[in-house]
Interface confidence: low
Amino acid sequence: MGHLSAPLHRVRVPWQGLLLTASLLTFWNPPTTAQLTTESMPFNVAEGKEVLLLVHNLPQQLFGYSWYKGERVDGNRQIVGYAIGTQQATPGPANSGRETIYPNASLLIQNVTQNDTGFYTLQVIKSDLVNEEATGQFHVYPELPKPSISSNNSNPVEDKDAVAFTCEPETQDTTYLWWINNQSLPVSPRLQLSNGNRTLTLLSVTRNDTGPYECEIQNPVSANRSDPVTLNVTYGPDTPTISPSDTYYRPGANLSLSCYAASNPPAQYSWLINGTFQQSTQELFIPNITVNNSGSYTCHANNSVTGCNRTTVKTIIVTELSPVVAKPQIKASKTTVTGDKDSVNLTCSTNDTGISIRWFFKNQSLPSSERMKLSQGNTTLSINPVKREDAGTYWCEVFNPISKNQSDPIMLNVNYNALPQENGLSPGAIAGIVIGVVALVALIAVALACFLHFGKTGRASDQRDLTEHKPSVSNHTQDHSNDPPNKMNEVTYSTLNFEAQQPTQPTSASPSLTATEIIYSEVKKQ
């Protein structure tokens, strides 16, 4: 769409002339029944830009049309009129010289100001002299300047001060947004917005609140973001750390200690040795140290702005002893032995000197029984004889006053060939024992009967002591892992003690019992 080639002239066109013009115009297109409307493009306009009031469904047969400022037709507020026949635009009282009307009735307003905001009414004069009207509107907003951030405290103290940022300028009809580290504001009780979001207050600042902070101002036609602002948060000093972390040094070495405490502004450091001031530096260097340099080394950190001080004390020991003990090796003469029969020697070997050795079995310090002996400066552990309870994990530890190290563990297995109690007796063995016991009891009964029958005067005094032992489960029922929980696994040992005296007149029918025999009959109750 081009502008009108001719400038807007203040021309009065008599209605008779308009009627004559209309009569000369012939429109063959059928009239439209659609509603006359006007649309603002854009609806929100930046100040200084232009807006087009676009017309839809313009009737075909018409004399002309006229635009007015406001929501109604008011001659005093006419902007421009247009007569189709003469293609002549006539400015009205409300014309500012920035308006252009097009043959399709659309109105262009250039270099808009905020005073242009509001309603505009189009009046269409049809060839039958019936008028139609349509009203549209637009809103003019200022082009926003680049904002800036002012602060009431650019050097706040951590955990003490609050900081209020204000976004300038204070513009009307503007939305204020804030960004921290290029992120929108997090939800935090320490962040408060006020003054229509123009002021951002940080309560009780921390060292992590340095920013950067940006504010953005927005209206429907423009947005602008400030330059970033950072906070110089004063804090610290935190508790200093002394590095390196080593405690032990050899004589002749150089002692170089460095102290650091997080602080803003950076901390001022001083060193004390055994409570005596040495120097005001961050690093302490002592060449060619001796045992006399052992002691407590204090780093003192001070922040002159916060007025806070922190100290850290480190103990330094200068010694010939090795600060690192090598891992010892453990060897066994055998790792699988027979209980109550074999012995075993465990040896702990190390290349370090000036060290001591200790032994551990199932986290217990050794030796733990008379059968265990340490020899060769504790390097060898001897177990003689090995018992069932000696089975398990052994390891040794080498140490000096400043360091220690452990060997890898070694496993000692203990077997019992005669009576592998862990696995119980086979049904055949149990049957054999039961039969033997029954037979023995029967034999004894026959012998007794004989003695009683013959009524010998030189009778053996016969004492029987029949006892029943029910040992606790914990002592006698290891490794019954398939038994259901909470079910008692009882092993009953019946012990028959025979105290036999030699009969004065032995009888061939009765065997002589020369020793007390103890026979275990193991019966598992399931």
């Epitope: 009431n152 650019s154 300028p169 009307q172």
Partner: antibody, heavy 121, light 107 residues
Framework: QIQLVQSGPELKKPGETVKISCKAS????????MNWVKQAPGKGLKWMGW????????TYADDFKGRFAFSLETSASTAYLQINNLKNEDMATYFC??????????????WGQGTSVTVSQ | DIQMTQSPSSLSASLGERVSLTCRAS??????LNWLQQEPDGTIKRLIY???SLDSGVPKRFSGSRSGSDYSLTISSLESEDFVDYYC?????????FGGGTKLEIK
């Protein structure tokens, strides 16, 4: 050029009401707020508050809450200061001053010539 | 409220002399400070905005500066029309506050 022209001097009795006008020209009135400033005879300047010329919302300093009212006639690009129930201590010169863009330090970039209010029996 | 303490309240000086007026802010106001000049007839105009920026049409002998919380207006070489009243104004937070003023008199 930008101008703020205030109404003429006023002579009032205690208890009366005075309304001072400040007509702006040379700029878009609704783009900039308007401040009001009091200067008692032989004294310094005191900020009374301001009015948002876009929304019409006034803001008053603590000492000027109650009897003082800011208003607008936007179509005439005019701001008004009304003082009700005049007291002797209200005798002063009152200035309007445009509230410019604060970004450029505009705070009070253009001033009216002042309106003298005399309160006398 | 932010207090603006202006000194001196009056100052006698000679033509061509260099003078400085000072305003001290009770809180941090950043650069949000203007200097105003008031003629004997009551007319007020702004000389300096944002601490140190010169308004258009203001002679270059006027300058503004800041040192911490002290803000200064310096006139490098006094001329006869400079012997009037001067005020500072802070606008960082509401209520906006003025200094008490300095009356510059010819010696």
């Amino acid at each position: 050029q930008i101008q703020l022209v205030q109404s003429g001097p006023e002579l009032k009795k205690p208890g009366e009401t005075v309304k001072i006008s400040c007509k702006a020209s040379g700029y878009i009135f609704r783009n900039y707020g308007m401040n009001w400033v009091k200067q008692a005879p032989g004294k310094g300047l005191k900020w009374m508050g301001w009015i948002n010329t876009y929304t019409g919302e006034p803001t008053y300093a603590d000492d000027f809450k109650g009897r003082f009212a800011f208003s607008l006639e936007t179509s005439a690009s005019t701001a008004y200061l009304q003082i009700n129930n005049l007291k002797n201590e209200d005798m002063a010169t009152y200035f309007c001053a445009r509230r410019g863009w604060l970004l450029t330090g505009g705070a009070m970039d253009y001033w009216g010539q002042g309106t003298s209010v005399t309160v006398s029996q | 409220d932010i207090q603006m303490t202006q000194s001196p309240s009056s100052l006698s000086a000679s033509l061509g002399e260099r003078v400085s007026l000072t305003c001290r802010a009770s809180q941090d106001i950043g650069s949000s400070l203007n200097w105003l000049q008031q003629e004997p007839d009551g007319t007020i105009k702004r000389l300096i905005y944002a601490t140190s920026s010169l308004d258009s049409g203001v002679p270059k002998r006027f300058s503004g500066s800041r040192s911490g919380s002290d803000y200064s207006l310096t006139i490098s070489s006094l001329e006869s029309e400079d012997f009037v009243d001067y005020y500072c104004l802070q606008y960082v937070s509401s209520p906006w506050t003025f200094g008490g003023g300095t009356k510059l008199e010819i010696k």
